[in-house]
């Protein structure tokens, strides 16, 4: 799961006006019983901000040890700090748990930049603001790490919610969610509402702020507006999907759709940005530059190096285009589109040197590992990971940041032919999954 621009996540986005939230629509088609409704105990159970990760409180061991755990749909290990580290306020102390079982096996997870390693075991795990169950789950006790934990992030571990195929050391290590579903009556589905603040948060504000919701085992209809639209999970490893078309302010990028998914497209809550393959990134930036050409932004802004600032409250949202990704639909030759605003892809950044202004970083970046729909995308939507039906649902988030003129949108259906051709088939020799 890409480190570097991965886990060091960031917040999502937008500046003024802050308080606008969409009203609920009432004309909804019912879903199958028990899958949908109110999950009051789980609403608002995430904290943090997209810049440093959204985390949920979990307890591990007996007696329970409370830890904050980063929610990551781009990896598949449940791994927690288990030794002192300068960036950790607390860590899992296996020797204090009467229910800890050592698996006598190590695990080593390298990234392009950094790594973590640890010892595998199992213990009892529960989520206080989640389903009222306790499960025995595999835990990687992190004993050594480099460039993994983030100073000030307030999380001490990671909950990899993707599939066993990308678990380390191999796919025989059952991921947490698989254990949860196997050992309880929790339906094989979870949903995420990540709420970007729309303005920079300092440390104390983050600790006090609500970051969103992880609904385990269902869908909470108070968290979204309009309808949910589903795209198939192409393959159960990452949450891989297929993008069939990209538009900037309604203008088609007109690329071979394979380029959009080269070498894959994934939905990843552990990544900050919308990350695009090199060719797609260059075309998208060219189009965004053209659309916003009334102002001349430095080259470093498009690289994510320079901030751009405006006098407080004067950010010209209207000069920036909306970005639409068309996703393969559930029906043959049918697609739907998700549309994000500049309030999602311009990330507010607090800098003391320019504190009198509203300053932003461009939160779309280049990738060599395919498209990554990170927090920039997810903060616009309520995202349903319907593992039981091998599909991912998108609806407009009730907490997304927008202005009085435009909102994020999920719309369809659209007729799109030959969508299967948009998927890229990774050569079987590629063993590199997490080495990105």
């Amino acid at each position: 799961t890409q480190h570097g621009i991965r886990l060091p996540l960031r917040s999502g986005l937008g500046g003024a006006p802050l308080g606008l939230r969409l009203p609920r629509e009432t004309d909804e088609e019912p879903e199958e019983p028990g899958r949908r409704g109110s999950f009051v105990e789980m609403v608002d159970n995430l904290r943090g901000k997209s810049g440093q990760g959204y985390y949920v409180e979990m307890t591990v061991g007996s007696p329970p040890q409370t830890l904050n755990i980063l929610v990551d749909t781009g990896s598949s290990n449940f791994a927690v700090g288990a030794a002192p580290h300068p960036f950790l306020h607390r860590y899992y102390q296996r020797q204090l748990s009467s229910t800890y079982r050592d698996l006598r096996k190590g695990v080593y997870v390298p990234y392009t930049q950094g790594k973590w390693e640890g010892e595998l075991g199992t213990d009892l795990v529960s989520i206080p603001h989640g389903p009222n169950v306790t499960v025995r789950a595999n835990i990687a006790a992190i004993t050594e790490s480099d460039k993994f934990f983030i100073n000030g992030s307030n999380w001490e571990g990671i909950l990899g919610l993707a599939y066993a195929e990308i678990a380390r050391p191999d796919d025989s290590l059952e991921p947490f969610f698989d254990s949860l579903v196997k050992q309880t009556h929790v339906p094989n589905l979870f949903s995420l509402q990540l709420c970007g603040a729309g303005f920079p948060l300092n440390q104390s504000e983050v600790l006090a702020s609500v970051g969103g919701s992880m609904i385990i085992g269902g869908i909470d209809h108070s968290l979204y507006t309009g309808s949910l639209w589903y795209t198939p999970i192409r393959r159960e490893w990452y949450y891989e999907v297929i993008i069939v078309r990209v538009e900037i302010n309604g203008q088609d990028l007109k690329m071979d759709c394979k380029e959009y998914n080269y070498d894959k497209s994934i939905v990843d809550s552990g990544t900050t940005n919308l990350r695009l393959p090199k060719k797609v990134f260059e075309a998208a930036v060219k189009s965004i530059k053209a659309a916003s050409s009334t102002e001349k932004f430095p080259d470093g802004f498009w690289l994510g190096e320079q901030l751009v600032c405006w006098q407080a409250g004067t950010t010209p949202w209207n000069i920036f285009p909306v970005i639409s990704l068309y996703l393969m639909g559930e029906v043959t030759n049918q697609s739907f589109r998700i549309t994000i605003l500049p309030q999602q892809y311009l990330r507010p950044v607090e800098d003391v040197a320019t504190s009198q202004d509203d300053c932003y970083k461009f939160a779309i970046s280049q990738s060599s590992t395919g498209t990554v729909m990170g927090a920039v995308i997810m903060e616009g939507f309520y995202v349903v990971f319907d593992r039981a039906r091998k599909r991912i649902g998108f609806a407009v988030s009730a907490c997304h940041v927008h202005d009085e003129f435009r909102t994020a949108a999920v719309e369809g259906p659209f007729v799109t032919l030959d969508m299967e051709d948009c998927g890229y088939n990774i050569p079987q020799t590629d063993e590199s999954t997490l080495m990105t």
């Epitope: 570097g4 621009i5 060091p8 960031r10 810049g51 440093q52 392009t112 930049q113 460039k147 983030i150 100073n151 000030g152 102002e295 001349k296 932004f297 430095p298 080259d299 470093g300 994510g304 190096e305 320079q306 901030l307 751009v308 600032c309 950044v349 800098d351 040197a353 320019t354 300053c359």
Partner: antibody
């Protein structure tokens, strides 16, 4: 408070190399690029290059390609610049500066003297 | 590379005066220009970004203006501590480049 700490002086022999450090504090190190700037006595400022500490991507002024190598150690929030094959032309003050809008924060600079 | 030209190496002024330091870019850089002040033996101190925005804590006697290729740093009511060197910088495109500097001196 954002601070960039650099050692004051480095005296080195011609033909050798030197590794300059810049220890950052007061902000999340991986969130901002780090730049290096050269200033020869009584002369202007020259941008050498920059590094993104989150993924170690670097970009250089062509004039310094092969001369400078930029690295970071995120565990200690420290950026480094190594200068190799030193000559008297490399005698200068070297500053690290953090990105933002332009360069809002600068280190105090390290004076490198190349002398036999 | 974009050349930033500060045509006056030295400028004479008096305490209490108003002085304008100019900088010319060899091509359009929009408003992506910063100004720095440097006391001899010290690191540059940021004054202005985006051509006209003052960094936090910079006294309002420093004013930046201009766009495109022509930029000006104006110091009204010059103080004795302002009698130092000033550099402009473009951060519109790589490589970032600086002007050669303008030193303020007592008349």
């Amino acid at each position: 408070e954002v601070q960039l700490q650099q050692p004051g002086t480095e005296l080195v022999r011609p033909g050798t190399s030197v590794k300059l450090s810049c220890k950052a504090s007061g902000y999340t190190f991986t969130n901002y690029w780090m730049h290096w700037i050269k200033q020869r006595p009584g002369q202007g400022l020259e941008w050498i290059g920059m590094i993104d500490p989150s993924d170690t991507y670097t970009k250089f002024n062509q004039n310094f390609k092969g001369k400078a190598t930029l690295t970071v150690d995120t565990s200690s929030s420290t950026a480094y610049m190594q200068l190799n094959s030193l000559t008297s032309e490399d005698s200068a003050v070297y500053y690290c500066a953090r990105s933002g809008v332009a360069f809002p924060y600068w280190g105090q600079g390290t004076t490198v003297t190349v002398s036999s | 590379d974009i050349l930033m030209t500060q045509s006056q190496k030295f400028m004479s002024t008096s305490v209490g005066d108003r002085v304008s330091v100019t900088c010319k870019a060899s091509q359009n850089v929009g408003r992506n220009v910063a100004w720095y002040q440097q006391i001899s033996g010290q690191s540059p101190k940021p004054l202005i970004y985006s051509a006209s925005h003052r960094y936090s804590g910079v006294p309002d006697r420093f004013t930046g203006s201009g766009s495109g290729t022509d930029f000006t740093l104006t110091i009204s009511n010059v103080q004795s501590e302002d009698l130092v060197e000033f550099f402009c910088q473009q951060y519109n495109s790589y490589p970032y480049t600086f002007g050669g500097g303008t030193k303020l001196e007592i008349k």
